[in-house]
Amino acid sequence: DLPQTHSLGNRRALILLAQMGRISPFSCLKDRRDFGFPQEEFDGNQFQKTQAISVLHEMIQQTFNLFSTEDSSAAWEQSLLEKFSTELYQQLNNLEACVIQEVGMEETPLMNEDSILAVRKYFQRITLYLTEKKYSPCAWEVVRAEIMRSLSFSTNLQKRLRRKD
C-alpha cells in the first residue's frame, strides 16, 4: 500500500529532521519568518487523488532539493542529512509509482499546475530567506522548523487520502 508507505516514510523523515537540530531554537526567535505555506493546497478536498499525489511529490522534491545543496551539507550533521535525503528519495520513488497506478484508474488525470506553482513559490521564499540571512545557523534552524511543519501537513493529507481509499 503506497500511501501507507509514504505516510510511514514521512514520519521517519520528520524524526530525522527533528534529530538534525544543532543549535537551540530559542536563540533564533527573532529570526522566525512567515513563509506563507500554501495550506489550501494541502486540504485534500478539492483534488482528485492523482492531483493530490502530484502536490505531495512536488513538496518532497523541493524539500529534497533544498537539503541537497552545498550550503545544506555545511549546515547539518552528514550521516543524519544522508539518511534524511535517502528517506525523501525513497518517498519520491513511491509517489511516482503511485501516480502511474492512479493514472490508470482515473479518467481525467488533470495536472494541478497552480498548486504546484504555489509550492514552488513557497520554496523560493525559503531559499531567498536563507540567502538573505547568509545561510546562518539560525536561518537553517528556522527553515528546519518550517519544513517539519510542512511535512506534517503532507502527512495529514496522506492520511486523508488513505481514508478515501
Epitope: F26, K30, R32, R33, D34
Partner: antibody, heavy 120, light 111 residues
Framework: QVQLQESGTVLARPGASVKMSCKAS????????MHWVKQRPGQGLEWIGV????????TYNQKFKDKAKLTAVTSANTAYMELSSLTNEDSAVYFC?????????????WGQGTTVTVSS | DIVLTQSPASLAVSLGQRATISCRAS??????????MHWYQQKPGQTPKLLIY???NLESGVPARFSGSGSGTDFTLNIHPVEEEDAATYYC?????????FGSGTKLEIK
C-alpha cells in the same frame, strides 16, 4: 492518543527539594519539546522552562533558573522537574505540557498537574 | 519580560451574546508576518486548552464561535454566540521572545 501522566500530590518542608515526573505516551517523546508551567491557587500561569528530551537541551525562564531543574529519561518516556530550596511561594500546581506547532511555541496536551504543598 | 495585560479581569455575558477579551503586550510580539500570541481556556479543576494560535488561527476541534484578531501589541479574543459551556477563565500567552509569559486571565461568567 497523546497522554501526559504526572506524579501525585507532594507535601514538603520549607528548604527541601521535590522531584516530579511526567510520563508521556502516544507520540514520539524524543522529538517534541516539553514545557513546564506553574499555577498558584486561584492565580494565573507562569512559564518555567522547556526541555528537548531528544538531547536534554533546556531553556529556562531566568526567574526559575536556580529553582527548577529539568531532565528527561528517554528510555522511560518521562520528563522530570526538580524544585529546590522550597518556600511557601512554591506551593502550586505544576503542569508538563507538550510543545505544539514547532517554533510557534504553543502547548497542546497538558498533564493533569502535580500539586506541591510547602508547609512546616 | 513582556507583560501581558488582560482586560477585563472578569465579565458576565448573556447567553447568545458576544464576549470580547483584550490582551495588550508591553512590547510587540509580531515579527515578519506572524503574531506570536495564543489563547487558552481553563475551566475550574481542568487543565488549560489551546483555542487560538498565532493570534487568529483556530485550533483543530475548537468551535468556530471562537475567533482571535490583532497584531503588534493589541490582541482580542471574541466568543459569539456565547454558550453555557464557555464559562471559564481565558488566558493569552506570547512566544515572541524569552521568557514566554501569560496574561493574568479573564473570568467569563454566563448570565
Amino acid at each position: 492518543q497523546v497522554q501526559l501522566q504526572e506524579s501525585g500530590t507532594v507535601l514538603a518542608r520549607p528548604g527541601a527539594s521535590v522531584k516530579m515526573s511526567c510520563k508521556a505516551s502516544g507520540y514520539s517523546f524524543t522529538t517534541y519539546w516539553m514545557h513546564w508551567v506553574k499555577q498558584r491557587p486561584g492565580q494565573g500561569l507562569e512559564w518555567i522552562g522547556v526541555i528537548y528530551p531528544g538531547n536534554g537541551d533546556t531553556t529556562y525562564n531566568q526567574k526559575f533558573k536556580d529553582k527548577a531543574k529539568l531532565t528527561a529519561v528517554t528510555s522511560a518516556n518521562t520528563a522530570y522537574m526538580e524544585l529546590s530550596s522550597l518556600t511557601n511561594e512554591d506551593s502550586a500546581v505544576y503542569f508538563c505540557t507538550r510543545n505544539y506547532k514547532y517554533d510557534y511555541y504553543t502547548m497542546d496536551y497538558w498533564g493533569q498537574g502535580t500539586t506541591v504543598t510547602v508547609s512546616s | 519580560d513582556i507583560v501581558l495585560t488582560q482586560s477585563p479581569a472578569s465579565l458576565a455575558v448573556s447567553l447568545g451574546q458576544r464576549a470580547t477579551i483584550s490582551c495588550r503586550a508591553s512590547k510587540s510580539v509580531s515579527t515578519s508576518g506572524h503574531s506570536y500570541m495564543h489563547w487558552y481556556q481553563q475551566k475550574p479543576g481542568q487543565t488549560p486548552k489551546l483555542l487560538i494560535y498565532l493570534a487568529s488561527n483556530l485550533e483543530s476541534g475548537v468551535p468556530a464561535r471562537f475567533s482571535g484578531s490583532g497584531s503588534g501589541t493589541d490582541f482580542t479574543l471574541n466568543i459569539h454566540p456565547v454558550e453555557e459551556e464557555d464559562a471559564a477563565t481565558y488566558y493569552c500567552q506570547h512566544s515572541g521572545e524569552l521568557p514566554f509569559t501569560f496574561g493574568s486571565g479573564t473570568k467569563l461568567e454566563i448570565k
